[in-house]
């Protein structure tokens, strides 16, 4: 058993049929010694008396808010949560496996630049009685500071018969140098509590590996005289690290119709303009990627050919 | 420690091409190592990230773009003195800071070159003959060093009398390649910045 926060405790249980469970001793936070009784949740049934209560925690029915009283007055609470371990593996029931970039990916994180600011998100099908708390650091032994905000519900989607909820959090490394060469990874730890179930999820990464620039901005077309070719130009996204001559991007320019199966014109360039062949009912799209360290491409920025 | 904005004529920076070749060569070599040593811990997640130049050179700090010198997190107190002549310095107006930056890059390359050559000598003794260093990568390191053209003491190649542990050598190769790739990215960014200045 360990303390998650004040008056909230996590009991780690090996979860299998007829498991013996864990013996837990609760102590009432009071100077009083006599006339103390214990109850669980909203029940008025007295579980025991005395300053300490010893319980055998085996299942969710044994978890909950234990309260000690004296003469009708509440003295203190202890909330017990369960953390299940099945076949030596901690349960991951609360969050959905996103399977990208690999299986057992519950947290996904992205950074728009090298400033040390990043966003992580996760998915769940649970809609109520759900809380998250996020901590982060650079490195695990002798950790350096990363400050994370509160996790918020950022999107709701319908997937078949189920509703899916996306939560996200923004974090900022306390003293980040965009030019630094990372040798210690960022660690992100999410505590998830659904009703009386506790789970924790972690992710470890270098900012350089989660970079995904915003799409290029200000796409413009200029038809070339006596030609089917057009010159397309664009600018670096505002959120990208500066100076751009140091943090350079490379671009992919594509002309394509509405269907992905349609024919296309595609060219890669380090410049902020390119010449392509425009077709009727097609769009010109441009996306960006760090020129020197190949992490993710940005989303496409598009303009119609016409 | 920073790079001044007034530096060589645009497009005349002779080291940019070599640094691009360097990044390409080390990236290819790292990819080859990951594939060949698939049953060894050779991915970014599996290895310890060590920097053999730590406390010996200060490339990131010495080569910091002027725009980032206002960022206190980027300023490091490490002081390193280097020789200040080099053929990549295409303008007489080149400052001492830029010379310091380029000589720091040169020292990085020299250190990695020695490590890679020592390692290759060990890998050539491996009866499995599983992996060797790409000669192209070694050649590209040499070309960039020649383009930088700094005079400095020759670092003797480390020779070891004991029987090499090939497993450890291959793990060390992965660690070295990952670190060198990261440094090659920094070098490329620096050269691109200088070329544009």
């Amino acid at each position: 058993i360990w303390e998650l926060k004040k008056d909230v405790y996590v009991v780690e249980l090996d979860w299998y049929p007829d498991a013996p469970g864990e013996m837990v001793v609760l102590t009432c936070d009071t100077p009083e010694e006599d006339g103390i009784t214990w109850t669980l949740d909203q029940s008025s049934e007295v579980l025991g008396s005395g300053k300490t209560l010893t319980i055998q925690v085996k299942e969710f029915g044994d978890a909950g808010q234990y309260t000690c009283h004296k003469g009708g007055e509440v003295l203190s609470h202890s909330l017990l949560l369960l953390h299940k371990k099945e076949d030596g593996i901690w349960s991951t029931d609360i969050l959905k496996d996103q399977k990208e970039p690999k299986n057992k990916t519950f947290l996904r994180c992205e950074a728009k630049n090298y400033s040390g600011r990043f966003t992580c998100w996760w998915l769940t099908t649970i809609s109520t009685d759900l809380t998250f708390s996020v901590k982060s650091s650079r490195g695990s032994s002798d950790p350096q500071g990363v400050t994370c905000g509160a996790a918020t519900l950022s999107a709701e989607r319908v997937r078949g018969d189920n509703k899916e909820y996306e939560y996200s959090v923004e974090c900022q490394e306390d003293s980040a140098c965009p030019a630094a060469e990372e040798s210690l990874p960022i660690e992100v730890m999410v505590d998830a509590v659904h009703k009386l179930k506790y789970e924790n999820y972690t992710s470890s990464f270098f900012i350089r590996d989660i970079i995904k620039p915003d799409p290029p901005k200000n796409l413009q077309l200029k038809p070339l005289k006596n030609s089917r070719q057009v010159e397309v130009s664009w600018e670096y996204p505002d959120t990208w690290s500066t100076p751009h001559s140091y943090f350079s991007l490379t671009f992919c320019v594509q002309v394509q119709g509405k269907s992905k199966r349609e024919k296309k014109d595609r060219v890669f360039t380090d410049k902020t303009s390119a010449t392509v062949i425009c077709r009727k009912n097609a769009s010109i799209s441009v996306r960006a990627q760090d020129r020197y360290y190949s992490s993710s491409w940005s989303e496409w920025a598009s303009v119609p050919c016409s | 420690r920073n790079l001044p904005v007034a530096t060589p004529d645009p497009g005349m920076f002779p080291c940019l091409h070599h640094s691009q070749n360097l990044l390409r060569a080390v990236s290819n070599m790292l990819q080859k190592a990951r594939q060949t040593l698939e049953f060894y811990p050779c991915t970014s997640e599996e290895i310890d990230h060590e920097d053999i130049t730590k406390d010996k050179t200060s490339t990131v700090e010495a080569c910091l773009p002027l725009e980032l010198t206002k960022n206190e997190s980027c300023l490091n107190s490490r002081e390193t003195s280097f020789i200040t002549n080099g053929s990549c310095l295409a303008s007489r107006k080149t400052s001492f800071m830029m010379a310091l930056c380029l000589s720091s890059i040169y020292e990085d390359l020299k250190m990695y070159q020695v490590e890679f050559k020592t390692m290759n000598a060990k890998l050539l003794m491996d009866p499995k003959r599983q992996i060797f260093l790409d000669q192209n990568m070694l050649a590209v390191i040499d070309e960039l060093m020649q383009a930088l053209n700094f005079n400095s003491e020759t670092v003797p190649q480390k020779s070891s009398l004991e029987e090499p542990d090939f497993y450890k050598t291959k793990i060390k190769l992965c660690i070295l390649l990952h670190a060198f790739r990261i440094r090659a990215v920094t070098i490329d960014r620096v050269m691109s910045y200088l070329n544009a200045s």
Epitope: T250, E262, K263, K264, R266, T269, D270, I277 | -
Partner: antibody, heavy 118, light 107 residues
């Protein structure tokens, strides 16, 4: 299986024209760009131009501009390359090529040898 | 026009040994570079697109690298069926242009 079948070999006199055909099978004809590339004996490959069969748009290499015409007939899934004012240096194997990507080729025809000789 | 220069023009290799062919562009073409294989009397076949993207059906012993002006096609271990002429082609701008070809022959 995508295939491009070209017309047979031709012998032409200098100053005349030649029209080579390329019939496509497998996949929808208008879903691909069609190019013509030639190879003189013992020489490398030389790009001549492309057509978008969907709308008839064409683009020619400046070297052949005014002498080459590329057309396409969607009803027969056939593309044509006509080269006029032939000279001896036009002796080459002419290949048609196609791809959904405009700037390179994933399928090429078997080639048509055009000999220009007096 | 962008001029593509291949080297060497002829490359004698022992079967089972690796081979590397270089292609240089007269100006920077990013990764807009493709490799083809051509055997005598046959049409060319696409091996690699955009400098390093492998093509389905092409053996994994063929790999490409490079960007900007310098590109390399590598065959990790030459098989008897790999003896052929190899061409690079740039797609950075029209007109599309090819290298002059590298003939890989049995040593």
């Amino acid at each position: 299986q995508v295939q491009l079948v070209q017309s047979g070999a031709e012998v032409k006199k200098p100053g005349s024209s030649v029209k080579v055909s390329c019939k496509a099978s497998g996949g929808t004809f208008s879903d691909y760009y069609l190019h013509w590339v030639r190879q003189a004996p013992g020489q490398g490959l030389e790009w001549m131009g492309w057509i978008d069969p969907e709308n008839g748009d064409t683009e020619y290499a400046p070297k052949f501009q005014g002498r080459v015409t590329i057309t396409a007939d969607e009803s027969t899934s056939t593309a044509y390359m006509e080269l006029s004012s032939l000279r001896s240096e036009d002796t080459a194997v002419y290949y048609c090529a196609r791809n959904k990507e405009l700037r390179y080729f994933d399928v090429l025809g078997q080639g048509t040898l055009v000999t220009v000789s007096s | 026009d962008i001029v593509m220069t291949q080297s060497p023009l002829s490359l004698p290799v022992t079967p089972g040994e690796p081979a590397s062919i270089s292609c240089r562009a007269s100006q920077s073409i990013s990764i807009n570079l493709h490799w083809y294989q051509q055997k005598p009397g046959q049409a060319a076949r696409l091996l690699i697109a955009f400098a390093s993207q492998s093509i389905s059906g092409v053996p994994s012993r063929f790999s490409g690298s490079g960007s900007g002006t310098d590109f390399t096609l590598t065959i990790s271990s030459l098989q008897p069926e790999d003896f052929a002429t190899y061409y690079c082609q740039q797609s950075n701008s029209f007109p599309l242009t090819f290298g002059q070809g590298t003939k890989v022959e049995i040593k």
